[in-house]
Interface confidence: medium
């Protein structure tokens, strides 16, 4: 599996999403663990409804929600006010038993550009305040890793 | 005319606590989040810490360094910014600038420690 | 962590000519809305440090023109088209893409 990189603001939220085939994956729950360490287990954070059929409806665990849209085919997380310490490697997965297939690896990057805050009427630079008209909306980022880049650096 | 003044900087002994004073004037204090940047001599400056601002919750950030030793706060009331400093380390010795990390830098104050 | 790496750490330029420095990154400093969180900082001896560039390539109020940024997502130049002696000093990148900010080691610029 590649790994797709997901971005969002320190303090907001970010919405990652997986998508599957929906016929393949048809009955599974799914689930959203976190990777500890290279090659660690992935600990799991949260999973969809016990009955597949309310999977549709958002469960939380802590500020991390998860629901699955089964006919599309969209496996959907939310990570509510994002902090540094959510930034790693993730995995959606679909649940078989005692098995589990990773749907997509995920890399969540948790992002805090100073000038990101700044109100249009205050600022200092000039010709810059298109940067700022959103400032305050949940965003979200997502693309492949650069080659060259790894989730985990080496440890020294 | 934007002025940030530190205070507090001084000789401590390793272990010892130190409170770090960054009183501000000329810009518009409650918006801007800010910043305590350390810099060791002959070395680069090394973010230590932010707090962001009223609207956000006052949410606060931390190098692993100083996570759990150093507390930042603010006071909108006086504009002006903290740096609790607990347990000292030898390493911690640097000039202490306040800064919104961007165009605000005020002038440092040193912090030594050595026994 | 972000780390970045600059190259030379030193330079040493006659009045009138050009300098460039360059700063590299480990991780991509691309984010949201393709802004890229890299900044360009002088440091004067004594003086704290001063913004010269902001977001990559963008000249923060009061900065001459002779200095310029520009880069990619992991590779990034400031470029000082005529230095003058007022110059002089240390040159810091930064990032504040994510945290922990970082800054890189410096380059110290003298003239001959």
């Known amino acids: 599996h590649n790994t797709t990189v997901f971005q969002g603001v320190a303090g907001q939220s970010l919405q990652v999403s997986c998508p599957y085939d929906s016929m393949k994956h048809w009955g599974r729950r799914k689930a959203w663990c976190r990777q500890l360490g290279e090659k660690g287990p992935c600990q799991r954070v949260v999973s969809t409804h016990n009955l597949w059929l309310l999977s549709f409806l958002r469960r939380w665990n802590g500020s991390t929600a998860i629901t699955d849209d089964t006919l599309g085919g969209t496996l959907t997380i939310t990570l509510r006010n994002l902090q540094p310490h959510d930034a790693g490697l993730y995995q959606c997965q679909s649940l078989h038993g005692s098995e589990a297939d990773t749907l997509r690896k995920v890399l969540v990057e948790v992002l805090a550009d100073p000038l990101d805050h700044r109100d249009a009427g205050d600022l200092w630079f000039p010709g810059e305040s298109e940067s700022f008209e959103d400032a305050h909306v949940e965003h979200s980022i997502s693309r492949s890793l650069l080659e060259g880049e790894i989730p985990f650096p080496p440890t020294s | 005319e934007v002025q940030l003044v530190e205070t507090g900087g001084s000789l401590v002994q390793p272990g010892k606590s130190l409170r770090l004073t960054c009183a501000t004037s000329?810009?518009?204090?409650?918006?801007?989040?800010l910043h305590w940047v350390r810099q060791s001599p002959e070395k680069h400056p090394e973010w230590v810490a932010h707090i962001k601002a009223k609207s956000d919750n006052y949410a606060t950030y931390y190098a692993e360094s100083v996570k759990g030793r150093f507390t930042i706060s603010r006071d909108d009331s006086k504009s002006s910014v903290f740096l609790q400093m607990n347990s000292l380390k030898e390493e911690d010795t640097a000039i202490y600038y306040c800064t919104d990390i961007l165009e605000y830098w005020g002038q440092g104050t040193l912090v030594t420690v050595s026994s | 962590d972000t780390v970045l790496t600059q190259a030379p750490l030193s330079v040493s330029v006659t009045p009138g000519e050009s300098a460039s420095i360059s700063c590299r990154s480990n991780?991509?400093?691309?984010?949201?809305?393709?802004?890229?969180?890299l900044y360009w900082f002088l440091q004067k001896p004594g003086k704290s440090p001063q913004l010269l560039i902001y977001?990559?390539?963008n000249l923060a109020s009061g900065v001459p023109d002779r200095f310029s940024g520009s880069g990619s997502e992991t590779d990034f130049t400031l470029k000082i088209s005529e230095v003058e002696t007022e110059d002089v000093g240390v040159y810091y990148c930064?990032?504040?893409?994510?945290?922990?900010?970082?800054f890189g080691p410096g380059t110290k610029l003298e003239l001959q």
């Open positions: 977001r990559m390539s």
């Open positions: 930064a990032q504040f893409l994510r945290y922990p900010y970082t």
């Open positions: 000329g810009f518009p204090f409650s918006n801007v989040w």
């Open positions: 991780k991509s400093l691309l984010g949201i809305r393709d802004i890229t969180s």
